[in-house]
């Protein structure tokens, strides 16, 4: 799903207040709901009729440093006989998410939000038919 | 997928530098890759064999203010005849994502990262059989 453009109004102070100095804001340390955890059914990536693999990307100057991307294993979907059914399609499910980018020059450290497109998994769909002229 | 605990080391300055004052950091305004967009196949939530509905939650003090959650429509999956096949299961695909929480008291505005669990869509799986003693 889409993250709307900031328009930078979210990060601005109320109009009656002095503006934010130097185009930066105060970000408190710590993460709210940090202990919240995904509780998905186990191994759904291999049990799915539209199975997928995971690739991990790592960047020490990004939080979270590890971002996991899914890739659908097949064009078709797996039928009850364990064979690929090409009349159906495995398609990626994508999500826009935020990460924090760390930028430092010597002892001056600043952070900036970054939008990342994550493929979370795959689902099996009936393909849309387009008649080509 | 899981976001690891911060351990707050990511947000700390190098050891040789003076510590961050007042437990906060500098967050630059603006979002990197803000124009990046999801390019999923259209209406996959209704074309999927494990279809889902969307619910939108809205919070003006969160960025993004709009967070969309998916809910699987069925316990089973939809077969080629358009009927629910209860021998297979529709299961949610979840993703941990970051949002920014805005906190203000008068003209003092600060921000904090918050972890949110998002159900992005559903996939059709073979259920795991557990033999109960």
């Amino acid at each position: 799903r889409k993250i709307p453009k900031v328009g930078h109004t979210f990060f601005q102070k109320p109009e009656s207040c002095p503006p934010v100095p130097g185009g930066s804001m105060k970000l408190d340390i710590g993460i709210i709901n940090e202990n919240q955890r995904v509780s998905m059914s186990r191994n759904i990536e291999s049990r799915s009729t539209s199975p997928w693999n995971y690739t991990v990307t790592w960047d020490p100057n990004r939080y979270p440093s590890e971002v996991v991307q899914a890739q659908c294993r097949n064009l078709g979907c797996i039928n009850a006989q364990g064979k690929e059914d090409i009349s159906m399609n495995s398609v990626p499910i994508q999500q826009e998410t935020l990460v924090v980018r760390r930028k430092h020059q010597g002892c001056s450290v600043s952070f900036q939000l970054e939008k990342v497109l994550v493929t979370v998994g795959c689902t099996c769909v009936t393909p849309v038919i387009h008649h080509v002229q | 997928r899981k976001i690891p605990k911060v351990g707050h080391t990511f947000f700390q300055k190098p050891e040789s530098c003076p510590p961050v004052p007042g437990g906060s950091m500098k967050l630059d305004i603006g979002i990197i890759n803000e124009n990046q967009r999801v390019s999923m196949s259209r209406n996959i939530e209704s074309r999927s064999t494990s279809p889902w509905n969307y619910t939108v939650t809205w919070d003006p003090n969160r960025y993004p203010s709009e967070v969309v959650q998916a809910q699987c429509r069925n316990l089973g999956c939809i077969n080629a005849q358009g009927k629910e096949d209860i021998s297979m299961n529709s299961v949610p695909i979840q993703q941990e994502t970051l949002v920014v929480r805005r906190k203000h008291q008068g003209c003092s505005v600060s921000f904090q990262l918050e972890k949110v669990l998002v159900t992005v869509g559903c996939t059709c799986v073979t259920p795991v059989i557990h033999h109960v003693q």
């Epitope: 064009l75 399609n89 398609v91 769909v125 393909p127 849309v128 038919i129 387009h130 | 196949s41 074309r47």
Partner: nanobody
Framework: QVQLVESGGGLVRTGGSLRLSCSVS????????MGWYRQVPGRQRELVAM????????YYADSVKGRFTISRINANNTIYLQMNNLKPEDTAIYYC?????????MGQGTLVTVSS
Amino acid sequence: QVQLVESGGGLVRTGGSLRLSCSVSGDISSQSAMGWYRQVPGRQRELVAMIHTTKGDTYYADSVKGRFTISRINANNTIYLQMNNLKPEDTAIYYCTHNEPGDLYMGQGTLVTVSS
């Protein structure tokens, strides 16, 4: 935008052979396939044969296995359907298709008639 150009349909006697060809141009992803569906008016469209564009895996309907062969020339994204030992029940409009995940592009079709 995907373009499909089909050729090779016609009239043939039972037991005869025909070769259909189709070339695809436009945006083609690595996870895609090309192939043929067929349809008899008033009946449901049937997948005949498909070939994966990168893996080269092939898929055939049970009714054509051992008689039809799908092949592909990578360089110009052209596929061929060699149809041998044709039967009257193979009479249909054959549609070239290009399948991107979630989207199936279908050509205008070429008529194959098998007379007994």
